[in-house]
Amino acid sequence: EPTMYGEILSPNYPQAYPSEVEKSWDIEVPEGYGIHLYFTHLDIELSENCAYDSVQIISGDTEEGRLCGQRSSNNPHSPIVEEFQVPYNKLQVIFKSDFSNEERFTGFAAYYVATDINECTDFVDVPCSHFCNNFIGGYFCSCPPEYFLHDDMKNCGVNCSGDVFTALIGEIASPNYPKPYPENSRCEYQIRLEKGFQVVVTLRREDFDVEAADSAGNCLDSLVFVAGDRQFGPYCGHGFPGPLNIETKSNALDIIFQTDLTGQKKGWKLRYHGDPMPCPKEDTPNSVWEPAKAKYVFRDVVQITCLDGFEVVEGRVGATSFYSTCQSNGKWSNSKLKCQPVDCGIPESIENGKVEDPESTLFGSVIRYTCEEPYYYMENGGGGEYHCAGNGSWVNEVLGPELPKCVPVCGVPREPFEEKQRIIGGSDADIKNFPWQVFFDNPWAGGALINEYWVLTAAHVVEGNREPTMYVGSTSVQTSRLAKSKMLTPEHVFIHPGWKLLEVPEGRTNFDNDIALVRLKDPVKMGPTVSPICLPGTSSDYNLMDGDLGLISGWGRTEKRDRAVRLKAARLPVAPLRKCKEVKVEKPTADAEAYVFTPNMICAGGEKGMDSCKGDSGGAFAVQDPNDKTKFYAAGLVSWGPQCGTYGLYTRVKNYVDWIMKTMQENSTPRED
């Protein structure tokens, strides 16, 4: 417990002190006081440096004194023989004696008292930054006007913090500028602008004078700018050492000015303003920015348009442009969106054709459609080559995005017909010689396939059966063979409007307009045994001349059989109509004069007994195309005749081309278009 005063006596005092003694006293007075220690008696064996016996006075780690020998007062009015004054409130006194004393020594008597210390003057380190005030037992610090005492109760500073600047433009200076700034202060200024504006600080070199750095380069007084996680500075010295224009990229800036106790200069002055936050002109490949500017700032909006062949894909929807806004954080909105090559996707399949897989389906890639040759060809031109266009479509130079159409090649038999062994006015034939040949089983008759959906035949074949069963692709019409061939199902029968319907068809003498069309329910797939015959052109090239040769085919009556099981064919010439008129009608059902002959009929045959007969009706009279010798067209349809084995009459198809085309057009399904 600290005391204000006390007495310290050597052991046995005032008797002689014993040998080999070591004793210590710890003196403590209250905080804020020093100690005055004084000796009134001192009688200790004398030795050099007091090595044998001594009294030692220690303050902290410092030896204040070491005493031995005898002392007497120099002042008759004072008993004090030795004294110590320490400005600390603790002191240690240590007494030591060695093993022998040649004489009898009485030791010492000492007293201590607490004394006031002047903290303001007694120490090397001044306790107060500005004014120090001593009092008994302590001191207090005080400050000049406009300064305040910090919480440590020792340091004074100016009240220069807490200012918040929100205006878009402003000026800030150190306290007292241009007079010296206060020492020992920390000034904090805050600039807080609206989001989307960055603080830009501008200084002039001559507006800055702050105590220079020490030899290690550390600023003793410093100015620091803090913007988010970025720091500019610390700055110090004569003349501003940093950039004169500081773009902080932030709407919030803290300015911190820290000074120490010494070396005040005039300080600093700065200006700031709010710049709309810039957004970088980003490199967005394959696109153009509108408007194009050297610098983009907060709230600027640009339209980013992809170059042709590129698109921006957002949520799996393709667009050619998007908008981006310069945001308050200096970043562009929609920055994840990119212009990427257009993907045209898997090319569409086409009927009776194919498209090879492209290496790529991206913009600029090329695909080629081909038709299933030799049975189909590309009707609508364009060559079949398509490229992936900028709009995401596969596009052809001629057709645009329209797909190619593979239509059957007409009039080309896989194997040409050759007259072999003579069989009563005709030859055996193979269906590959006449792939257009259609077999009707009720009535037993023929027809000609003219495209995927249509069969041409004679009106008299279908007038009695509007739902005929037809077959294609078989040379033999044996039931077992027909089961393996392709059966065609009719959707509708169209008989020429000029065909006169009779109550008793058996007595017919007028076969004018003996032509009909059968629309099929499903398209026919073409191949070596099934392929259409061409229709005649409308030009005069397709007008038949006497002697022109044509081919007929069918499973009709032969000399030996009423019906043929295997396909028969013959080559016959066109004859003048009068030749047919001159032949006497076999088993006439009316007067010979009643039989009607019109320009819609072709007369053919008469050579070597080759002729069509009952059961061949509706089959084609196929003539080589005058403009393309590789093809055959249906010049006629087996219609009627005065007598088998002579001349026969055939419906002149050329006269009905318009009706055929119109009927097919009006009754086609969209899928066939």
């Epitope: 929807v317 045209c344 898997i346 569409e348 399949s349 897989d357």
Partner: antibody, heavy 118, light 109 residues
Framework: EVMLVESGGGLVKPGGSLRLSCAAS????????MSWVRQAPGKGLEWVAT????????YYLDSVKGRFTISRDNSKDTLYLQMNSLRAEDTALYYC???????????WGQGTLVTVSS | QIVLTQSPATLSLSPGERATLSCTAS???????LHWYQQKPGKAPKLWIY???NLASGVPSRFSGSGSGTDYTLTISSLQPEDFATYYC??????????FGQGTKLEIK
Amino acid sequence: EVMLVESGGGLVKPGGSLRLSCAASGFTFSNYAMSWVRQAPGKGLEWVATISSGGSHTYYLDSVKGRFTISRDNSKDTLYLQMNSLRAEDTALYYCARLFTGHAMDYWGQGTLVTVSS
Amino acid sequence: QIVLTQSPATLSLSPGERATLSCTASSSVSSSYLHWYQQKPGKAPKLWIYSTSNLASGVPSRFSGSGSGTDYTLTISSLQPEDFATYYCHQYYRLHPITFGQGTKLEIK
């Protein structure tokens, strides 16, 4: 006549695998892009995957990407769907379909049932 | 992805009546790539109308399709007993995925 016949369906535990096949006939298989479409019991149709005619381009429904693989063998006129890491929500009748003009599916098989259950 | 919404979910009509089925896309669809399918219970779907208005092979002429952009319609001029089924619309978009509507069930009243 165009025909598509699926096979390979069955009962499988979650996390298991199945391989579906679709045998095509009656048309030139290598000329057509093909798709798999599924129908959960009592629900609507959901497209699963598409493959181009030559097999070099494939597209998948997001939820099956990385788990299912569509492939084809044009020499065998067969379409496949390899299904790995199956989940309960993959339970459905799986149809294969031929793609026609406009990527319409003009011919469908009768379907094969896949049940994923523990 | 493009979402197709069919309405109504169920349509109850009598034979001989006119039926109008609607399909609305969440964003514009090319008319070339909008198709309709008919499905009867226990059977596979059948292509019914393709590219908005083209009838598939064998589909009776009482059926018709129309529309553009986001709104498409399948119409049956005079319902026949065999027309009662579920109809799905379907769109293809090159960026995928291909999507179907949830279906409209056409039932006999």
